[in-house]
């Protein structure tokens, strides 16, 4: 009679984490008498997965009824597969012996690989804001995937980026892997509404990649441009001076008016105008009582934006160009009178 063969038809199988794996095994003969055992690995360190005769294997069920006298199918199903279950599984026939069964024949083995989805990519930007023309780094991380092969791409507003470096860890074997990528992005003044996207593609995602995003509004600082202008005379002794603060981001801004270098008023930007590109404009104005000045006045609009060093713009107000009030005995009012509401807004 032909000697018993142990047939494992599948050289390899791939199963998604959480699913069940079916490991097929048939024998070609009922002789010799003895049990079948399933092992992961080979040699003295192999791990017993299922023993037909004894033991408790809660995740393992047999595909066919092993109690039937003529059964030759010893396939098993392992439930709730995790990446830690990866390995080579062997179906081994033992021959009845005393006191122990003797290993008789082994199948060729079935390699089980486990597919695990990557976690949603998390994109993080620099800790501090940066200004246009500067290069900033963004990182993208995703974890827990298997197998190791994975593709990561970076985009800015739909345009693919090329300046990035990606590592998949660990370099050696692991039940699951992580990816870490750093991309360099050059900021422009128009980037307040821009997004940086990290896209991860993996065999487990069936062509539907995962994306992580970061808004450049959290990274960029667009410094304001200042313009101080003198408006036409409102009343005979009053001049309206405005400070236009344009194209800044974020909103946090404090403005100080100085008269010949002396602080006269400080105000915080409140009602702002938003531009199409996401930046803001703001305007503050002053009514200057010219009659209170004997000499020309240097007015300075000083702006502190988002905690950065102040920038300023000055305007020289020519007093001589305006007639002085004659014969007034009343003490002059304050040199600077602001319009109501205080500071105004535009």
């Amino acid at each position: 009679e032909e000697e018993l063969q142990v047939i494992q038809p599948d050289k390899s199988i791939s199963v998604a984490a959480g699913e069940s794996a079916t490991l097929h095994c048939t024998v070609t003969s009922l002789i010799p008498v003895g049990p079948i055992q399933w092992f992961r690995g080979a040699g003295p360190g192999r791990e017993l997965i299922y023993n037909q005769k004894e033991g408790h294997f809660p995740r393992v069920t047999t595909v066919s009824d092993l109690t039937k006298r003529n059964n030759m199918d010893f396939s098993i199903r392992i439930s709730n597969i995790t990446p830690a279950d990866a390995g080579t599984y062997y179906c081994v026939k033992f021959r009845k012996g005393s006191p122990d069964h003797v290993e008789f024949k082994s199948g060729a083995g079935t390699e089980l690989s486990v597919r695990a989805k990557p976690s949603a990519p998390v994109v993080s930007g620099p800790a501090a804001r940066a200004t246009p023309q500067h290069t900033v780094s963004f990182t993208c991380e995703s974890h827990g995937f298997s197998p190791r092969d994975i593709t990561l791409k970076w985009f800015k507003n739909g345009n693919e980026l090329s300046d990035f470096q990606t590592n998949v860890d660990p370099a050696g074997d692991s039940v699951s892997y992580s990816i870490h990528s750093t991309a360099k992005v050059v900021l422009t003044r128009e980037d307040v509404h821009s997004q940086v996207i990290c896209e991860v593609a993996h065999v487990t995602l069936q062509g539907d990649p995962l994306r992580g995003t970061a808004n450049l509004s959290e990274t960029i600082r667009v410094p304001p441009t200042l313009e101080v202008t003198q408006q036409p005379v409102r009343a005979e002794n009053q001049v309206n001076v405005t400070c236009q603060v344009r194209k800044f981001y974020p909103q946090r801004l404090q403005l100080t008016w100085l008269e010949n270098g002396n602080v006269s008023r400080t105000e915080t930007a409140s009602t702002l105008t938003e531009n199409k590109d996401g930046t803001y404009n703001w305007m503050s104005w002053l009514l200057v009582n010219v009659s209170a000045h004997r000499d020309d006045v240097k007015l300075t609009c000083q702006v502190e934006h988002d905690g950065q060093p102040a920038v300023s713009k000055s305007h020289d107000l020519k007093v001589s160009a305006h007639p002085k009030e004659q014969g007034s005995n009343t003490a002059p009012g304050p040199a600077l009178a602001s319009a109501a509401p205080l500071g105004g807004s535009g």
């Epitope: 690995g41 080979a42 003295p44 360190g45 390995g87 080579t88 290993e103 008789f104 082994s106 199948g107």
Partner: antibody, heavy 122, light 112 residues
């Protein structure tokens, strides 16, 4: 092709612990046993122990109380620690790969590192 | 532990001539699956050992066919059909039936 590289200090003081690492490159740790074998100067080979890909260890009883072999699959490395060393532990230490097949068992130590000399001296 | 005994201790050889090394084990290395758990290794001067023969008679990859292994149970032989200069070194047998794996004391092959 698979290569093994031992690393660790060349000199260890008596009564201290010897620590060696073997880095596996060009192949996987899975499905193999990973051995440490030593050779005292001018003498023969002594098997110290091995570890399987699942972390199961087997040691030479003559050294068992002093030897620990561990595996870091993520780094493709395995390590040897031997405590309370004496001058008798001076040797060339080799790391090696042992093949294994179901139905056969151990099937030859087919890849060896180049060996690292460890001297135990004060 | 299984004790492995090699002979001779030293073997002077002439290039082109055959050579033979004996290895005996203190217990049978023949398992019920019909395999003999005996390997042969060559350690060339200043080098690491290399696998020549595994499971008693199987030549390892890249090993010249002038090397052959034979024997069963407790008595094993490594034969070199025609010795070449590169064959000098120490030859070791090793049993892989059970742990601890044990080596023979070695046979030093040198050119006459």
């Amino acid at each position: 092709q698979v290569q093994l590289q031992e690393s660790g200090p060349g000199l260890v003081r008596p009564s201290e612990t010897l620590s060696l690492t073997c880095t596996v490159s060009g192949g996987s740790i899975r499905n193999y046993y990973w051995s440490w074998i030593r050779q005292p100067p001018g003498k023969g080979l002594e098997w110290m122990g091995f570890i399987y890909d699942n972390g199961r260890t087997f040691y030479n009883p003559s050294l068992k109380s002093r030897v620990t072999i561990s595996l870091d699959m993520s780094m493709n490395q395995f390590s040897l620690k031997m405590t309370s060393v004496t001058a008798a532990d001076t040797a060339v230490y080799y790391c090696a790969r042992v093949r294994a097949y179901s139905g056969i068992g151990l099937d030859g130590t087919d890849v060896w590192g180049q060996g690292t000399t460890v001297t135990v001296s004060s | 532990d299984i004790v492995m005994t090699q002979s001779p201790l030293s073997l002077p050889v002439t290039p082109g001539e055959p050579a033979s090394i004996s290895c005996k084990s203190s217990q049978s290395l023949l398992y019920s699956n019909a395999y003999n758990y005996l390997d042969w290794y060559l350690q060339r001067p200043g080098q690491s050992p290399q696998l020549l023969i595994y499971l008693g008679s199987n030549r390892a990859s890249g090993v010249p066919d002038r090397f052959s292994g034979s024997g069963s149970g407790t008595d094993f032989t490594l034969k070199i059909s025609r010795v070449e200069a590169e064959d000098v070194g120490v030859y070791y047998c090793m049993q892989a039936l059970q742990t601890p794996l044990t080596f023979g004391g070695g046979t030093k092959v040198e050119i006459k």
